[in-house]
Interface confidence: medium
């Protein structure tokens, strides 16, 4: 069956304000496993940011780091 | 082993919609990323574009931004690609794959793929 090398990180919480963009150095989907569809943003200092994938900055995000690929 | 079917294929005219889908079996979708990628003849194969499935981020080319949508039926373990006011340069074989991509477009990131489905458009 379809097993992906996956971070298995967990958003039980998304950040209730915008981070800047420009803090942002990379993203990933949080598992299927886990309560709450997720967005993990990794900052240019090693953090992890629990985002919502349905707010329009987070797909903004996404989009221009899928854009950078 | 996985498999990924695509089906709705076909002729049309300029300006008309057609809907592809890709059934998968064999697996589940969770914690994979599925792509539709097309290829004309005598061009390289290319990204249309693609869906995460936890979130459904999705992200498209410059190329079908707009025109083209990707939906997903969790029941069915099925991927749409709705594109809607085709060109002639739309016309192509398209692919869908499952697979991690650390990036959408990463192509060589997609483990498993479809037999692919021809679309022509005619002017």
């Known amino acids: 069956s379809l097993a992906a090398d996956t971070p298995t990180a967990c958003c039980f919480s998304y950040t209730s304000r915008q981070i800047p963009q420009n803090f942002i150095a990379d993203y990933f989907e949080t598992s299927s496993q886990c309560s709450k569809p997720g967005v993990i943003f990794l900052t240019k200092r090693s953090r992890q940011v629990c985002a919502d994938p349905s707010e329009e900055w987070v797909q903004k995000y996404v989009s221009d780091l899928e854009l950078s690929a | 082993e996985v498999q990924l079917v695509e089906s709705g294929g076909g002729l049309v005219q300029a300006g008309d919609s057609l809907r592809l889908a890709c059934a998968a079996s064999?697996?589940?979708?969770?914690?994979?990323?599925m792509g539709w990628f097309r290829q004309a003849p005598g061009k390289e194969r290319e990204f249309v574009g693609a869906l995460r499935w936890i979130t459904r981020i999705t992200y498209y080319a410059d190329s079908v931004k707009g025109r083209f949508t990707i939906s997903k039926d969790n029941a069915k373990n099925t991927v749409y690609l709705q594109m809607n006011s085709l060109k002639p340069e739309d016309t192509a074989v398209y692919y869908c794959a499952a697979g991690s991509p650390s990036r959408l477009v990463n192509m060589n990131q997609y483990n498993y793929w479809g037999q692919g489905t021809q679309v022509t458009v005619s002017s």
């Open positions: 064999g697996g589940t979708f969770s914690n994979y990323a």
